[in-house]
């Protein structure tokens, strides 16, 4: 014998108080699958959470975090504070990157500057708390007699199209 509730589609529930007929989910609730005997309460995105997707009769609301925070956990169950570039989030709050390390994002940890000399290159631009060093050509490339870099093509005058 088929369970009459199996005919109830998503967005409804099988109402035992009304001879197991399919009733629509009440406001602020949903059922994402058919054959449900109850509807689930919609998630409310409050406080540091903000609504990314409204609740419907067939799907739960989805939250993300307000500016200054980012999501953690399944389904954005938690919001973790952002730090500034040049900082990292420790257990006890945002801390500046130590000398020799950088972070160019608002989350994550400070990473060591690239060691240019490991690749036989020189430092072209020094690193900062926010930016990695930029490695330049190797000293051998700068020595006399080394093949020179091809010069750029001369720029065209404005308003002149190529013939």
């Amino acid at each position: 014998l088929q369970d009459p509730c199996s005919n109830c589609p998503a967005g409804t529930f099988c109402d035992n108080n009304r001879n197991q007929i399919c009733s629509p989910c009440p406001p602020n609730s949903f059922s994402s699958a058919g054959g449900q005997r109850t509807c689930d309460i919609c998630r409310q995105c409050k406080g540091v959470f903000r609504t990314r997707k409204e609740c419907s009769s067939t799907s739960n609301a989805e939250c993300d975090c307000t500016p200054g925070f980012h999501c953690l956990g399944a389904g954005c169950s938690m919001c973790e504070q952002d730090c500034k570039q040049g900082q990292e989030l420790t257990k006890k709050g945002c801390k500046d990157c130590c000398f020799g390390t950088f972070n160019d994002q608002k989350r994550g940890i400070c990473r060591p500057w690239t060691n240019c000399s490991l690749d036989g290159k020189s430092v072209l631009v020094n690193g900062t708390k926010e930016r990695d060093v930029v490695c330049g050509p190797s000293p051998a490339d700068l020595s006399p007699g080394a093949s020179s870099v091809t010069p750029p093509a001369p720029a065209r005058e404005p308003g002149h199209s190529p013939q």
Partner: nanobody
Framework: EVQLLESGGGLVQSGGSLRLSCAAS????????MSWVRQAPGKGLEWVSA????????DYADSVKGRFTISRDNSTNTLYLQMNSLRAEDTAVYYC????????????????WGQGTLVTVSS
């Protein structure tokens, strides 16, 4: 599958006490440090306390030092947080979190979280 299940939250008067538990399964519990973190209404995540795999080393946020005590029972795979002298500002959802190594780091470096248990402190 790693699972962390918190319990013990509830409504308590200011100055009162609660003991939170976190039942862990799906990994070698004694091999990993564990932490408690919390999220107060309208606020971001705040780390509360951490404990090493053996339980021999602990650390606390300044806001709970001297009031909260973290402990663990590796024979039953359970993490605890004893909370005394509770204040209204301790109201939050409390999560237990698995660290990635035997010793806890300075970083917010967790790979698994529980679903959380709500602690409400009324003044």
């Amino acid at each position: 599958e790693v699972q962390l299940l918190e319990s013990g939250g509830g409504l308590v008067q200011s100055g009162g006490s609660l003991r939170l538990s976190c039942a862990a399964s799906g990994f070698t519990f004694s091999s990993y440090a564990m932490s408690w973190v919390r999220q107060a209404p309208g606020k971001g995540l705040e780390w509360v306390s951490a404990i090493s795999g053996s339980g021999g080393s602990t650390d606390y946020a300044d806001s709970v030092k001297g009031r909260f005590t973290i402990s663990r029972d590796n024979s039953t795979n359970t993490l605890y947080l004893q909370m005394n002298s509770l204040r209204a500002e301790d109201t939050a959802v409390y999560y237990c979190a698995k660290e990635r190594a035997y010793d806890y780091s300075n970083y917010v470096d967790f790979d698994y979280w529980g679903q959380g248990t709500l602690v409400t402190v009324s003044s």
